[in-house]
Interface confidence: medium
């Protein structure tokens, strides 16, 4: 008789999840000499141990501590780029500006980027059918708790000037409920971080509005200022040209506006 299985509202674990995590770990440690000491099998064991045999609505940050310890990594604290709802451009940017880092440029972020995973209480099985949805099922699920944990640690590590890319095409340019708005903003350390500089990325070709005046940006400024961190905001009108001109500042097209 097949065992009853909990049906969750979200998609199940990404297929070939263990193999994917292990392969990503090997690739990352090969590319990044400072992480060559990492034992990828131990990393996978720690990752697995965080959620296997545990109820997928009852995961805690403590469950991920062994993984956090193995994935400890020092990135230049003044070269951190946060992002909200504009991941692809942020990643394209750090691929060009190689001395800056998003969370997904770190080992732990790289391992989990775009993946879903969960287990089942009291069995060693990975659930490939469904996993809890943050809204419809529960917030303390394996994926959400992982990103909350690594995002908090990433923000805590930041210093000097921290940059954040925000999506100017969304109704809420700054969203208090995003990972950036709910976790990272509140874990920047005022004694280390001097300024948060927001880059609002415009979507429309003819959009020349000053989106730094948007009410949600003013809300972000207020939250940051109350934490004794300075706030700065920039409009990026032409993200395609912005990337091109960061890559090649001498390009003739870089004499016109971005």
């Amino acid at each position: 008789v097949p065992r009853w299985r909990q049906q969750w509202s979200g998609p199940g674990t990404t297929k070939r999840f263990p193999e994917t995590v292990l392969a990503r770990c090997v690739k990352y440690t090969e590319i990044h000499p400072e992480m060559r000491h990492v034992d990828c099998q131990s990393v996978w064991d720690a990752f697995k141990g965080a959620f296997i045999s545990k109820h997928p609505c009852n995961i805690t940050e403590e469950d991920y501590q062994p993984l956090m310890k193995l994935g400890t990594q020092t990135v230049p604290c003044n070269k951190i780029l946060l992002w909200s709802r504009i991941k692809d451009l942020a990643h394209q940017f750090t691929q060009v500006q190689r001395d800056m880092f998003t969370l997904e440029d770190t080992l732990l972020g790289y391992l989990a980027d775009d993946l879903t995973w969960c287990g089942e209480f009291n069995t060693s099985k990975i659930n490939y059918q469904s996993c809890p949805d943050w809204r419809k099922d529960c917030s303390n699920n394996p994926v959400s708790v992982f990103w909350k944990t690594v995002s908090r640690r990433f923000a805590e590590a930041a210093c000097d000037v921290v940059h954040v890319m925000l999506n100017g095409s969304r109704s809420k340019i700054f969203d208090k409920n995003s990972t950036f708005g709910s976790v990272e903003v509140h874990n920047l350390q005022p004694e280390k971080v001097q300024t948060l500089e927001a880059w609002v990325i415009h979507g429309g070709r003819e959009d020349s509005r000053d989106l730094c005046q948007d009410p949600t940006i003013k809300e972000l400024e207020s939250i940051i200022s109350k934490r004794n961190i300075q706030f700065s905001c920039k409009n990026i009108y032409r993200p395609d040209k912005f990337l091109q001109c960061v890559k090649n500042p001498e390009d003739s097209s870089c004499t016109s506006e971005i």
């Epitope: 000037v161 409009n235 001109c245 960061v246 004499t255 016109s256 971005i258």
Partner: nanobody, 124 residues
Framework: QVQLQESGGGLVQAGGSLRLSCAAS????????MGWFRQAPGKEREFVAA????????AYADSVKGRFTISRDVTKNTIYLQMNSLKPEDTAIYYC?????????????????WGQGTQVTVSE
């Protein structure tokens, strides 16, 4: 956010020249519009000149047109204000600022990073 440091101010006689510099540090991979503003004792801070992110567009206050020239050296992350035919009414603290956009904006509200200022005094 960039840190901005002005230099080149001083005391000069009317009709003389000065060249102000503003060095930017803290973000070298992309630049935004930059401007010079000034504030005389008891007066509000006012726009003097601006230059866009690549140095291809400039804007000036009417009171300095033809006398002042703004320029930038992108490789050195520095902007300059060449001030000729100085007048006593040019006496003020001159501030360098970085804009929120890539353009040469004349509006003070479009600037969000400021230097400490450098004093320019023009005597009769």
């Amino acid at each position: 956010q960039v840190q901005l440091q002005e230099s080149g101010g001083g005391l000069v006689q009317a009709g003389g020249s000065l060249r102000l510099s503003c060095a930017a540090s803290g973000r070298t991979f992309v630049s935004f519009g930059m401007g010079w503003f000034r504030q005389a004792p008891g007066k509000e801070r006012e726009f003097v000149a601006a230059i866009n992110w690549r140095g291809s567009t400039t804007a000036y206050a009417d009171s300095v047109k033809g006398r002042f020239t703004i320029s930038r050296d992108v490789t050195k992350n520095t902007i300059y204000l060449q001030m000729n035919s100085l007048k006593p009414e040019d006496t003020a603290i001159y501030y360098c600022a970085e804009g929120r956009t890539a353009s040469a904006s004349t509006m003070i509200r479009e600037y969000d990073s400021w230097g400490q200022g450098t004093q320019v005094t023009v005597s009769e």
